[in-house]
Interface confidence: low
């Protein structure tokens, strides 16, 4: 999906009002410093590229994102402020819903909520600092 | 309505530095990047760097490295981009421009550097 | 660093024509393309960014492309006051780079 017509505007509000605190929920009990940052972004279309692929897409050790509160209210926001990002989730939402596993948090799943909250602050400070 | 105004034409002679100055108005100052683009006469244009006006983290380009400094003052909403050790092919008009995603919506007016003997 | 090919340098057109500015980017820069419009002693002008959105207040007649690497600025009823020199540049991560440009005159 090209992100490049969302409205940042409107989803960095919904990131600020709810996401962030769901976010933070998640990895309540977790230190701050207890996961580095692997996972950047350049620009805001990259950031939400980046943040939709750790949300919604199963990784090793970490199957059960799609579910959680963060994830659900992202999904509304991208599917609100982004246009025609729904119809492209649909058939990806069916193979999801057909390999679902018993919700667990792993420290897998911590470790990529944290590369998550770091996406998001990028996402409201776009632009790569590196070279 | 949003403006980047920017300092007066200079002239200085080779060796010397310049400061110029972008006074921003009519958006939030530090939710932008500045960036600073020159543009020597006749030629096109050359990025130069960013800062970031909410923490003054700067990047400059690998040949500007040693001779420019950016700051910001965020208590009048102005970048300053400092030139030093000025030789005759910074003879340019150097621009600021902000921006969020890296395309630059709005423009300073442009300062014209002239470095001559 | 991704280096921006800008062609051609300078064309010649009348008013109605139909214009095709092309920049080619040296490796994958996906949507991150901007274009800009000059006129002589003032600052540039956002026309396109994300290569194919239209800057507020721009005129329709002014489009964007891209495909692959290569990006496209066409203008499709020249007007007077669209004489100028149009210039790409990147915007996928530093260093920022432009294109050489491209001045369009009046034939």
């Known amino acids: 999906y090209d992100f490049t017509n969302c409205d940042f505007e409107k989803i960095k509000a919904a990131y600020l009002s709810t996401i962030s605190k769901d976010l933070i929920t998640y990895m309540s009990g977790t230190k701050s410093t207890e996961f580095n940052n692997t996972v950047s972004c350049s620009n805001r279309p990259h950031c939400l590229t980046e943040i939709q692929s750790l949300t919604f897409n199963p990784t090793a050790g970490c199957a059960s994102l799609a579910k959680e509160m963060f994830a659900m209210k992202t999904k509304a926001a991208l599917a609100i402020w982004c246009p025609g990002y729904s119809e492209t989730q649909i058939n990806a939402t069916q193979a999801m819903k057909k390999r679902r596993k018993r919700k667990v948090t792993t420290n897998k799943c911590l470790e990529q909520v944290s590369q998550l909250q770091g996406l998001w602050r990028r996402f409201n400070r776009p632009l790569l600092k590196q070279q | 309505e949003v403006q980047l105004v920017q300092s007066g034409a200079e002239v200085k002679k080779p060796g010397a530095s310049v400061k110029v100055s972008c006074k921003a108005s009519?958006?939030?100052?530090?939710?932008?990047?500045m960036h600073w683009v020159r543009q020597a006469p006749g030629q096109g244009l050359e990025w130069m760097g960013m800062?970031?006006?909410?923490?003054?983290?700067?990047t400059l380009i690998q040949k500007f490295k040693d001779r420019v400094t950016m700051t910001v003052d965020k208590s009048t909403s102005t970048a300053y981009m400092e030139l030093s050790s000025l030789r005759s092919e910074d003879t340019a008009v150097y621009y600021c421009a902000r921006t969020l995603d890296g395309y630059y919506d709005y423009w300073g007016q442009g300062t014209t550097v002239t470095v001559s003997s | 660093d991704i280096q921006m090919t800008q062609s051609p340098s300078s064309l010649s057109a009348s008013v109605g024509d139909r214009v095709t500015i092309t920049c080619r980017a040296s490796e994958n820069i996906y949507s991150y393309l901007a274009w800009y419009q000059q006129k002589p002693g003032k600052a540039p002008k956002l026309l396109v960014y994300?290569?194919?959105t239209l800057a507020e207040g721009v005129p329709s007649r002014f489009s964007g492309s891209v495909s692959g690497t290569d990006f496209t600025l066409t203008i499709s009823s020249l007007q007077p006051e669209d004489f100028a020199t149009y210039y790409c540049?990147?915007?996928?991560?530093?260093?920022?780079?432009f294109g050489g440009g491209t001045k369009v005159e009046i034939k």
């Open positions: 009519g958006y939030t100052f530090t939710t932008y990047w």
């Open positions: 800062i970031d006006p909410s923490d003054s983290e700067t």
């Open positions: 994300f290569a194919k």
């Open positions: 540049q990147h915007h996928y991560g530093t260093p920022w780079t």
